[in-house]
């Protein structure tokens, strides 16, 4: 029965003469008169079994003492640590020529576990032992007793087991502990690789080269490989392992991403949290679900936030000349997170006083630059036919419309064709500028072609460039345009109504808003 | 879902000592669980955690000193060779499953070291 | 190991009035936004208010709010009550390591 003793992780210890409860019974050689085993105290008052023998008056001594048969284990260099304590023999009077200072050390490999006696000529020689701390008769007056260590190793080993036996020549010893061991590389856990228990080569020069195995939830990037050194450290870990998608390194394993956490890939890279509008309900997810109404495209990482699709264009525009029609509208107010945003033109032709009577315009009509995904916020459409009735609408799509098509995405404008509108607006004036405001004036189009019914003003700041404007209709020819920002310019155009629809906007008026209140006049061109 | 806290007592330096916390109404194996202390009078102080797969971390100040462990319902800490710097409340504390924080705490059980 | 500190250790104020506490990381916790706010009153454990730095735990009234990103936190509680005097701790994950602020003593006047 062997009592617990604490060693380093890198050590295996095959024998500890200290752990042994009882008697050690080991053979010795003669069986009396040389070692002989005696039970001591160590320093925690703890009895110990020792070998002691103290022929030192005798020439020619020949004592062996064996230890029973120790298993190897696999291992091709084992280490013998001995714990030995040597009488100076300048302490002892009258044992000049016979008294010695060292003993021998040997082994013998076997496969035998039950050899019961002492061929001295089957073992081989490890070394001889000398004290680096011998002891006078002062030392044992006052209870010193100096403890020597000495560490041998041995190998290789190739047989089942071996034995160890010590041979005095004629000194004064004990054996206060012989212990055992061999080394090994301890599991460890680098780079996500787990690399077993690896028992060290057989000369202190070797590496053995081991292959480790990616822990839980993960998978190699680079093989990893890692070399056991004869002293029972890893060195020199090459490749690694990646925590699978859905999970992160913590603390050297892949643990599941948390609740509302994602990742997609097998990386290095920690869990994220679910991007906006999105979310997920259990460990481990490698995507987030969208909330209800957003999307996410087909070419969406899963990193980006949750979408949905834009609201309808804003500001439709429709300019009817003939069988002609231009149309101009203004970007969605939410374009539903995204930057992918499009427009389609739908046309239908609609029966005389029913609208319901509507039916697709067909391939004859022509739209430029085209009828679908449009980047800008005007189409023209032309080879309609005369007298007839138009509906268009505007369809405000993205790279998630396709997941929630709805009327809410569209505008849309009934127009008829044939009818000549008026023709363009030829002077446009500034008459009175102040801080906020701008009053307007402008002449009747040379060419009404009926009765006006109102006019529209189409006004927005100069370094907006269109982008995003404003309509002001009023049926008398002039008006106020309030609400302005100070020192600011401002491009305005007018167009003139009647029941054919509307004309051809005005040259553009440029208008810079004062600081003072002044009243200039415009010529059509430039004011400021 | 609680958690109790137990084994703490007045001590001898250098004497082990094991504190358990008890868990009910959720399975050890769904969870981490960490040991936060909190000496008289000072702020709170993380020691370590054990992940559900049974291994476990420290905080750098706490390697060597501390041991914890569980069964299927107990998570134990073991204080390995107490000084008088360890005289504490110890709490035990449930990390959330949806943040990186404990959402669950024990009510503590105090340690006193004194010779 | 990242280091949590919180400038003040005690703040006070009157009943209605509000308090704001600072937590400042020496490293950018996990995500940017792992922190999350405990009251502690003597002889009690903690209890969570916040999580991930702005999301109010479950049972806690609204008006205590926390927000910051990255080194940087606060804790605000508004319309302060008596019930509120109590110590306030932050927490913060980075690379396994949780690491508490020293903690802040609200004086309720």
């Known amino acids: 029965v062997t009592g617990s003793r604490v060693y380093p992780a890198n050590e295996v210890t095959l024998l500890d003469s200290r752990s042994v409860q009882g008697e050690l019974g080991w053979i010795a050689s003669p069986l009396e008169g040389g070692w002989e085993e005696v039970s001591i105290m160590d320093e925690k008052n703890t009895p110990i079994r020792t070998y002691q023998v103290c022929n030192v008056m005798e020439p020619s001594q020949n004592n062996w003492l064996r230890t029973d048969w120790i298993t190897r284990e696999g291992a091709q260099r084992v280490y013998i640590e001995i714990k030995f304590t040597l009488r100076d023999c300048n302490s002892l009077p009258g044992v000049m020529g016979t008294c010695k200072e060292t003993f021998n050390l040997y082994y013998y490999e076997s496969d035998n576990d039950k050899e019961r006696f002492i061929r001295e000529n089957q073992f081989v020689k490890i070394d001889t032992i000398a004290a680096d701390e011998s002891f006078t008769q002062v030392d044992i007056g006052d209870r010193i007793m100096k403890l020597n260590t000495e560490i041998r190793d041995v190998g290789p080993l190739s047989k089942k087991g071996f034995y160890l036996a010590f041979q005095d020549v004629g000194a004064c010893i004990a054996l206060v502990s012989v212990r055992v061991f061999y080394k090994k590389c301890p599991l460890t856990v680098r780079n996500l690789a787990q690399f077993p228990d690896t028992i060290t080569g057989a000369d202190t020069s070797s590496l053995v080269e081991v292959r480790g195995s990616c822990v839980n939830n993960s998978e190699e990037k680079d093989v990893p490989k890692m070399y056991c050194g004869a002293d029972g450290e890893w060195l020199v870990p090459i490749g690694n392992c990646l925590c699978n998608a859905g999970h992160e390194e913590r603390s050297g394993e892949c643990q599941a991403c948390k609740i509302g956490y994602y990742k997609a890939l097998s990386t290095d890279a920690t869990c994220a949290k679910c991007p906006p509008h999105s979310y997920s309900v259990w460990e481990g997810a490698t995507s987030c679900t969208c909330d209800r109404g957003f999307f996410r495209a087909d070419n969406d990482a899963a990193s980006m936030p949750c979408t949905r699709p834009p609201s309808a264009p804003l500001n439709l525009i429709s300019n009817v000349n003939e069988t002609s029609v231009n149309l101009e509208w203004s970007s969605p107010q939410n374009t539903g997170g995204r930057q992918d945003i499009s427009y389609n033109v739908v046309c239908k032709k609609c029966g005389a006083g029913d609208p319901s009577k509507c039916r697709p315009c067909g391939s004859g009509v022509h739209y430029t630059p085209q009828q679908n995904g449009l980047k800008t916020t005007k189409v023209s459409i032309t080879d309609l036919l005369a007298h007839t009735n138009y509906t268009f609408e505007i369809w405000a799509v993205n790279g998630v419309s396709k997941y929630n098509p709805s009327p809410d995405q569209s505008v849309s404008v009934t127009v008829t064709t044939n009818q000549a509108a008026p023709s363009s607006i030829a002077l446009v004036q500034a008459k009175e500028v102040t801080r906020y405001s701008v009053a307007l004036a402008w002449l009747e189009p040379d060419r009404p072609n009926g009765v006006i019914l109102e006019y529209e003003v189409k006004y927005y700041e100069k370094d907006q460039n269109e982008r995003s404007y404003r309509i002001v209709r009023t049926a008398a020819r002039n008006t106020d345009i309030k609400g302005l920002n100070p020192l600011t310019s401002y491009v305005f155009h007018v167009r003139a109504r009647t029941a054919a629809g509307y004309g051809d906007f005005s040259e553009p008026l440029e208008v810079t808003t004062n600081t003072v209140p002044s009243r200039i006049i415009g010529d059509g061109a430039n004011s400021t | 879902q609680s958690l109790e806290e137990s084994g703490g007592r007045l001590v001898t330096p250098g004497t082990p000592l094991t504190l358990t916390c008890t868990v009910s109404?959720?399975?050890?194996?769904?969870?981490?669980m960490s040991w936060v202390r909190q000496a008289p009078g000072k702020g709170l102080e993380w020691i370590g955690i054990i992940y559900r797969s049974g291994n476990t971390y420290y905080a750098n100040w706490a390697k060597g000193r501390f041991t914890i462990s569980k069964t299927s319902t107990t998570v134990d800490l073991k204080i390995t060779s107490p000084t008088t710097e360890d005289t504490a409340t110890y709490f035990c504390?449930?990390?959330?499953?949806?943040?990186?924080?404990?959402?669950?705490w024990g009510p503590g059980t105090l340690v006193t070291v004194s010779s | 190991d990242p280091v949590l500190t919180q400038t003040a250790s005690s703040v006070s104020a009157a009943v209605g009035g509000t308090v704001t506490i600072n937590c400042q990381a020496s490293q950018s916790v996990y995500g940017n936004n792992e922190l999350a706010w405990y009251q502690q009153k003597p002889g009690q454990p903690p209890k969570l208010l916040i999580y991930t730095a702005s999301s109010l735990a479950s049972g806690v009234p609204s008006r205590f709010k926390g927000s910051g990103s990255g080194t940087e936190f606060t804790l605000t509680i508004s319309d302060l009550e008596c019930a509120d005097a109590a110590t306030y701790y932050c927490l913060g994950y980075k690379s396994d390591d949780y690491t508490f602020g020293g903690g802040t003593e609200v004086v309720v006047k």
């Open positions: 109404g959720f399975s050890l194996s769904s969870y981490h």
């Open positions: 504390a449930r990390e959330s499953s949806t943040f990186y924080g404990m959402d669950l």
